[in-house]
């Protein structure tokens, strides 16, 4: 083993370096000293370090480590934060457009129901927005409230426009009759199923993204232990005490130190992997009735169909409700007038397939692909940090924490550390409390994601009994029940091409193309064209 190079006789180099860390040179010895008070950079001979310098090095080493960790996670953090913002805004835009489409449908087809319908539609979509953002609202209650509110207006304005004002105090009775007589057929149930499934998935997707941000933020701001600070000081700064300013730590030694320092953080790895894979599974299932964009943008059509259903049954309904709500005190006897033959043949409920332009769904898949490139983020952290801090290539002529060596040997390094700080002890301490907390949160979200992810093949399951749908409710496949009625089947074209230009856009190069090409098909299925009308104005 070669003898160490002679220390700087005047500690001049050390002084000039330390000046950058700590202005004022009172702690730096003029010439090498025995250094018997040192606790980390234990000297083999005279040293240019003092106890105060050692403390400053430890502080700097821990700060360096925090900065390295933050820069390591910067790209991942940016990816999730931006996507969470993009999707949150995108979902809000979908809700606003769905509300506009529904209002337009009422205005074009049922002008006598506006402005009351606008009010009820507005309240419904406000609840939808709140639900997506985590509010404790029951989706079935939202849908029931919409139909409960609409029916009295439909009854008094469409079915019985000549009702005298004195008869208008029957609203409560009409609200009750709406459910008892199933006046909208199975449409409310259909909408409940679609909306609850799609919104649940949307909500959990946003929750998962926000938790991803929390995970990164937690590990990003970890405070490293004093033990770790000592190890880092020994690796990065103790060589300076011997005047070895240009020497770099051995790569193998860096890996050992980083694994020790990051033992707790690396424990997140297993749950992080599961998080990304579970999120991928959820995203893969987000289509048809599990895709809120698809469901909400087609909702106006289903509501239109439900009103047509009422109109087709107006004769029977008017008679029944006339008896039922003639006097509000008769309300408790509603069930006695329940007509057996009220329901229309379910075969009339035809399906309109939704033309679905790839926008939000392709954006989600793009996010998953990018996230998957970070699947080993936590297990790879020690190596990443070493590769982004100065280390000697090929482990030759490098610093092993005690001296300059020609080749790094982990065994030799361990032997040389016998009297010093023990790496094994550091690993045994277990993760920081904040890391344990974040692991618990990851476990919880992973469980939720697994619960929400549809098993393979479930999305197209033909057996709908568990949903309470009778065969024939809506074609053969509940997942295709997006609406559509007899004559002019209403088709919806996804209008969210603007997503590519959202203010938060991740990277312009990766944004989905904002293709403006309109084929004849585009014109046929423009969203606003057929909001209930079979004739399109732009032909």
């Amino acid at each position: 083993q070669p003898p160490p190079p002679p220390p700087d006789a005047t500690c001049h180099q050390v002084r000039s370096f330390f000046q950058r860390l700590q202005p004022g040179l009172k702690w730096v010895p003029e010439t090498p000293v025995p250094g018997s008070d040192l606790q980390v950079c234990l000297p083999k001979g005279p040293t240019c370090c003092s106890r105060k310098m050692e403390e400053k090095y430890q502080l700097t080493a821990r700060l360096n480590m925090e900065q390295l960790l933050q820069s390591a996670s910067m790209e991942l953090k940016f990816l999730i934060i931006q996507n969470a913002a993009v999707f949150q805004e995108a979902f809000e835009i979908v809700v606003r457009h769905a509300k506009n489409y529904t209002n337009a449908m009422f205005k074009n087809n049922y002008p006598s129901l506006t402005p009351q319908a606008f009010e009820f539609v507005g309240e419904f979509f406000t609840d939808v927005s709140l639900y997506i953002l985590g509010s404790d609202i029951n989706v079935d209650d939202m849908v029931n409230e919409l139909f409960d509110s609409l029916f009295p207006v439909i009854y008094t304005q469409l079915m019985n426009p000549g009702l005298p004002d004195s008869a208008l105090d029957i609203n409560e009775c009409l609200r009750g009759a709406r459910r008892d007589l199933k006046v909208f057929g199975n449409f409310p149930k259909l909408i409940m199923t679609q909306v609850s499934k799609s919104l649940q998935v949307t909500r959990i997707f946003l929750q998962a993204l926000n938790l991803g941000i929390e995970v990164i933020n937690t590990t990003d701001h970890l405070k490293f232990s004093k033990d770790c600070g000592r190890m880092l000081t020994r690796m990065w700064y103790c060589s300076y005490c011997q005047g070895l300013m240009m020497v770099k730590p051995c790569g193998g030694y860096c890996n050992v130190v980083m694994q020790g320092c990051m033992a707790g953080v690396v424990e997140i790895d297993k749950y992080w992997r599961e998080y990304i894979l579970s999120l991928e599974e959820l995203v893969n299932g987000m289509y048809r009735i599990y895709d809120m964009e698809n469901v909400l943008l087609g909702l106006f059509s289903t509501i239109h169909d439900s009103i047509q259903y009422v109109q087709k049954n107006a004769g029977k309904l008017t008679t029944t409700i006339g008896k039922l709500c003639a006097h509000s005190q008769q309300r408790q006897y509603r069930s006695a007038y329940y007509p057996e033959d009220l329901f229309i043949d379910k075969k009339v409920l035809k399906v309109a397939h939704v033309e679905h332009e790839e926008t939000l769904s392709s954006r989600r898949r793009e996010l998953i692909q990018k996230l998957k490139s970070f699947i080993s983020f936590y297990s790879a952290l020690p190596g990443y940090i070493c590769s982004h801090s100065p280390v000697a290539e090929n482990d030759t002529l490098c610093w092993n924490g005690q001296e300059l060596v020609e080749r790094y040997s982990q065994k030799a390094a361990r032997n040389g550390m016998k009297n010093q700080f023990n790496l094994h002890e550091l690993k045994m301490k277990g993760p920081e409390p904040v890391v344990s907390q974040i692991i618990d949160k990851l476990k919880h979200i992973n469980q939720l994601l697994r619960t929400m992810s549809m098993p393979k093949g479930r999305v197209l399951d033909k057996n709908l009994d568990e949903e309470g749908f009778e065969s024939g409710d809506c074609g053969d496949d509940e997942d295709e029940c997006i609406g559509g009625s007899g004559d002019g089947m209403i088709k919806v074209k996804n209008q969210l091409r603007f997503l590519a230009e959202l203010a938060y856009d991740l990277d312009v190069d990766d944004a989905p193309g904002n293709s403006q090409q309109a084929t004849p098909k585009d014109n046929e299925i423009s969203t606003f064209h057929n909001l209930g009308n079979v004739h399109s104005p732009l032909k």
Epitope: K99, N100, N108, F118, N514, T527, F528, P537
Partner: antibody, heavy 116, light 108 residues
């Protein structure tokens, strides 16, 4: 293809009532709203109001007190009346088919001049 | 009431791309429609629902809408595109039609 043909008096004195009619040819009348829009010389478009086949109207608040839009479904026509006109009402008046939320087809326009 | 703001004029060389903006509070939440008006003629709908074209309108006309700005883009501009362009929204909260002030497109 739907066509909108409009006509009415082109020269009015202040305080008189502007009266225009628009006839709809070659398309459904009942499925849409029908609108009036005006454009003062060298200026932008201003929405006046709308009506549907059942007579349901909706007006621009700034003109509401002076505007009446009516419909005659038997003739597939709708009309605009604007009372107490002043020089500020000088404009080209357009009728249009309004398929909420846009105006898909327009009449040729009628220049109405208010001058004493 | 809802207000739409357009630049009074935009100039562009033939063959280049013209972009006409329409600003409004959270306009991205609304459907935006664009009309072209040539001197002495009635307006013609060129883009509806942010980005769709009626039949007969060239593919050179496209639209986008996000945040507080909607944009009408005319690529490979021709002399015949010189006209006034108006944006329009339906403000469903007031149930009124609202127009922007218009933008004069000059082809240099």
């Amino acid at each position: 293809q739907v066509q909108l043909q409009q006509w009415g008096a082109g020269l009015l004195k202040p305080s008189e009532t502007l009266s225009l009619t628009c006839a709809v040819y070659g398309g459904s009348f009942s499925g849409y709203y029908w609108s009036w829009i005006r454009q003062p010389p060298g200026k932008g478009l201003e929405w006046i109001g709308e009506i549907n086949h059942s007579g349901s109207t909706n007006y621009n608040p700034s003109l509401k007190s002076r505007v009446t839009i009516s419909v005659d479904t038997s003739k597939n026509q709708f009309s605009l009346k604007l009372s107490s006109v002043t020089a500020a009402d000088t404009a080209v008046y357009y009728c249009a088919r309004y398929y909420v939320p846009y105006l898909s087809d327009w009449g040729q326009g009628t220049l109405v001049t208010v001058s004493s | 009431s809802y207000v739409l703001t357009q630049p009074p004029s935009v100039s562009v060389a033939p063959g280049k791309t013209a972009r006409i903006t329409c600003g409004g509070d959270n306009i991205g939440y609304k459907g935006v429609h664009w009309y072209q008006q040539k001197p002495g003629q009635a307006p013609v709908l060129v883009v509806y629902d942010d980005s769709d074209r009626p039949s007969g309108i060239p593919e050179r006309f496209s639209g986008s809408n996000s945040g507080n700005t909607a944009t009408l883009t005319i690529s490979r501009v021709e002399a015949g595109d010189e006209a006034d362009y108006y944006c329009q929204v339906w403000d469903s909260s007031s149930d009124h039609v609202v127009f922007g002030g218009g933008t004069k497109l000059t082809v240099l």
